[in-house]
């Protein structure tokens, strides 16, 4: 267990041109507050997923009124640290979101109004117990300077807050196999206190009070040898009574999620989906109302009408979720037509159109043939965003500029011979076949499968394809 601590040093205009306007005015005095959201791991989706490591809200800063004509200075900040307690091990890698909120204190109907001024996010590696890490993040024209650290709550120590310490019993050294607790050299690493009676040979623990069995042993105290002979399905931690391997307790057994949170197993542990009004690794943080600014991404908070709807976030376009914490993948609706590429820019959707199409959603088919000429008497045909030439006989290629070999495709069936001709091609059919492409057999009795051949042509004569 331990605490993540965040100290905001300054929030104000960043360097460079385009200084932001002050968020407060004489007519609309305001004050700032901050919100931090932490998630374990180097997750890309920190903004859209629950604050599984925890979240915290600062106090409100001093009321600030802009001095007329003055540029926006660094704004007055709330006192104190933002502290996010964590109950389990510190993960070492984490993602953060820090939001700067403005509370307007003018004559608002229904109380103060909140709006999101800036939001920064990042992914960091951090060992618990280390020094303060300093950081600068920019959001638009604003700049946020802050420091952070993770510290363990006694008796936990170590970079993950998983080792336990206790005062030295002997003045000079620690017990066998136990190291001094740097930096507290007067303390020793304590052996974990496992569940009372846990077998010292066949059991171990990673958390105080538990008893986990080595392979081949089972039972609540790991004193029962596993006998798999009478078991149907050896599958996992074993049953104390039979010594058979049975499905063991899952991370969601007993539902570790408080306040009605629902538990789902993850590859490494579990994840709680918290009801509205609760958050934290186990949904243990509660009592959230609009005064706590629970709506992310500029969502508008209104008071709900019953305890299960303590607040309601009306999300801006592009966001959803009970706290507007999820970014909507608006491109998944495939709004761009005719094969256009969809780009979700956050504030708007943009479609990048294929050649031959235009419009906000690529809905307009451009006149592909405009200004396009087909040579040698070919005609232009529109379609699919690209012009195509339908070429006159004897010509081919994209613009009908190539002289075509009409026999290249071997058009004469049943072994007929092909001859190129100024007006196309001629097939000389093999005996027994007739037709422009020698496609029709001649019946054995001399009658063809077609009406009588045109005058002047006998079956078997070369026939010209007109």
């Amino acid at each position: 267990a331990g605490v993540f601590e965040l100290q905001i040093h300054s929030f104000g205009p960043g360097p460079g041109p385009g200084a932001p306007r002050s968020p407060c005015s004489a007519r609309l005095p305001c004050r700032l507050f901050f919100r931090v959201c932490l998630k374990p791991g180097l997750s890309e989706e920190a903004a859209e997923s629950p604050c599984a490591l925890g979240a915290a809200l600062s106090a409100r800063g001093p009321v600030y009124t802009e001095q007329p004509g003055a540029p926006a200075p660094d704004l007055p900040l709330p006192d104190g640290l933002l502290q996010v307690p964590f109950r389990d091990a510190w993960p070492g890698t984490f993602s953060f979101i820090i939001e700067t909120w403005r509370e307007e204190l003018g004559d608002q109907i229904g109380g103060p109004a909140w709006s999101l001024l800036a939001r920064v996010a990042g992914r960091r590696r951090l060992a618990a117990g280390g020094p303060w890490a300093r950081d600068i993040q920019r959001a638009g024209a604003w700049e946020l300077r802050f420091s952070y650290r993770a510290r363990c709550e006694p008796p936990a120590v170590g970079t993950a807050c998983t080792r336990l310490c206790r005062p030295r019993s002997a003045p000079s050294r620690c017990g066998p196999g136990l190291r001094p607790c740097a930096p507290l050299e007067d303390e020793c690493e304590a052996p974990l206190v496992c569940r009372a009676g846990c077998s010292p040979e066949h059991g171990f623990c990673e958390q105080p009070g538990e008893c986990r069995c080595l392979e081949g042993w089972t039972g609540p105290l790991c004193t029962v040898p596993v006998s798999t002979s009478s078991c149907l399905s050896p599958r996992g931690p074993s049953s104390a009574t039979t010594g058979c391997l049975v499905p063991g307790p899952g991370p969601c057994d007993g539902n570790p999620c408080a306040n009605g949170g629902s538990c789902s197993e993850t590859p490494r542990s579990f994840e709680c989906t918290c009801p509205r009004g609760f958050y934290g690794l186990r949904c243990e943080v509660s009592g959230v109302t609009c005064a706590d600014g629970p709506c992310f991404n500029g969502g508008l908070c209104v008071g709900g009408a019953d305890p299960d709807s303590a607040y309601i976030c009306h999300c801006p376009p592009g966001f959803q979720g009970s706290n507007c914490e999820k970014r909507v993948d608006r491109c998944s609706l495939q709004p761009c037509r005719n094969g256009g590429l969809c780009l979700d820019l956050g504030h708007a959707l943009r479609c990048r159109c294929r050649a031959g199409f235009a419009g906000p959603r690529c809905e307009h088919d451009l006149d592909d043939c405009a200004g396009r000429a087909c040579a040698n008497g070919g005609t232009c045909v529109e379609g699919g965003g690209a012009h195509r030439c339908s070429c006159a006989l004897g010509f081919g290629g994209r613009d009908c500029r190539e002289r075509a070999d009409p026999c290249a495709a071997r058009p004469c069936a049943h072994g007929g011979r092909c001859y190129a001709h100024f007006s196309g091609l001629v097939c000389a059919c093999a005996p027994g076949y007739m037709g422009a492409r020698c496609e029709f057999p001649v019946h054995p009795d001399g009658a063809s499968a077609l009406p009588a051949a045109p005058p002047g042509l006998r079956p078997g004569d070369p026939q010209r394809y007109l």
Epitope: G110, G111, G260, G261, S262, T273, C274, P275, T289, V302, G303, G304, A305, D306, P307, D308, S309, A310, Y311, I312
Partner: antibody, heavy 117, light 109 residues
């Protein structure tokens, strides 16, 4: 538009039973707690029962006047809310409403339950 | 069990401002009571006006507003109209139990 449609009311004798249903449409039923409220003829409103959502383990709450006689339940797959009423008394005669609280109160049109000998 | 008290009747004139109140026997009404205001018109026609103390329902005229005044929840009608003549109920949540007031009969003469 959110719609709540109650059915199942009718005339029943004292100590009899009746089951009311409420069909819900146009909102994500599974997310929210649901309630039954009643109004006896010429009287005010009385809250009867409440059932929370799955993530709150479908916890139920009852007014003292109906405890141990009425049972509220829900079928999330059908977006249906129910009120099983047993051992009915004459004072249970009322218009029964299916009610949902979110940003404000949403009401059905009600179904009339008359308990009479 | 908490008791919620409202004025039994109030009379106002068109264009006047009138305030209806809702008192809790357990002490001051707070935002944790999620005060709700409901309008009943003849033929059992109920309309949710205000939820969560001051959140006006969509479609409800802006002349209706909810607030906390002192230790009570309040519904204010600024510029009452004849069609506002109705019975108004307030409801307060106490954890997961809801208690209604007896209702205020508002007459607009």
């Amino acid at each position: 538009e959110v719609q709540l449609v109650e059915t199942g009311g009718g005339l029943v004798q004292p100590k009899g039973s009746l089951k009311l249903s409420c069909a819900v449409s146009a909102f994500t039923f599974t997310t929210y707690a649901m309630n039954w409220v009643r109004q006896a003829p010429g009287k005010g409103l009385e809250w009867v029962a409440r059932i929370r959502n799955k993530s709150n383990n479908y916890a139920t709450y009852y007014a003292d006047s109906v405890k141990d006689r009425f049972t509220i339940s829900r079928d999330d797959s059908q977006s249906m809310l129910y009120l099983q009423m047993n051992n009915l008394k004459i004072e249970d005669t009322a218009m029964y409403y299916c009610v949902f609280y979110y940003d404000h109160v949403y009401w059905g049109q009600g179904t009339l339950v008359t308990v009479s000998a | 069990q908490a008791v919620v008290t409202q004025e039994s009747a109030l009379t106002t004139s068109p264009g006047e401002t009138v305030t209806l109140t809702c008192r809790s026997s357990t002490g001051a009404v707070t935002t944790s009571n999620y005060a709700n205001w409901i309008q009943e018109k003849p033929d059992h026609l109920f309309t949710g006006l205000i939820g969560g103390t001051n959140n006006r329902a969509p479609g409800v005229p802006a002349r209706f507003s909810g607030s906390l005044i002192g230790d009570k929840a309040a519904l204010t009608i600024t510029g009452a109209q004849t069609e506002d003549e109705a019975i108004y109920f307030c409801g307060l949540w106490y954890s997961n139990h809801l208690v209604f007031g007896g209702g205020t009969k508002l007459t607009v003469l």
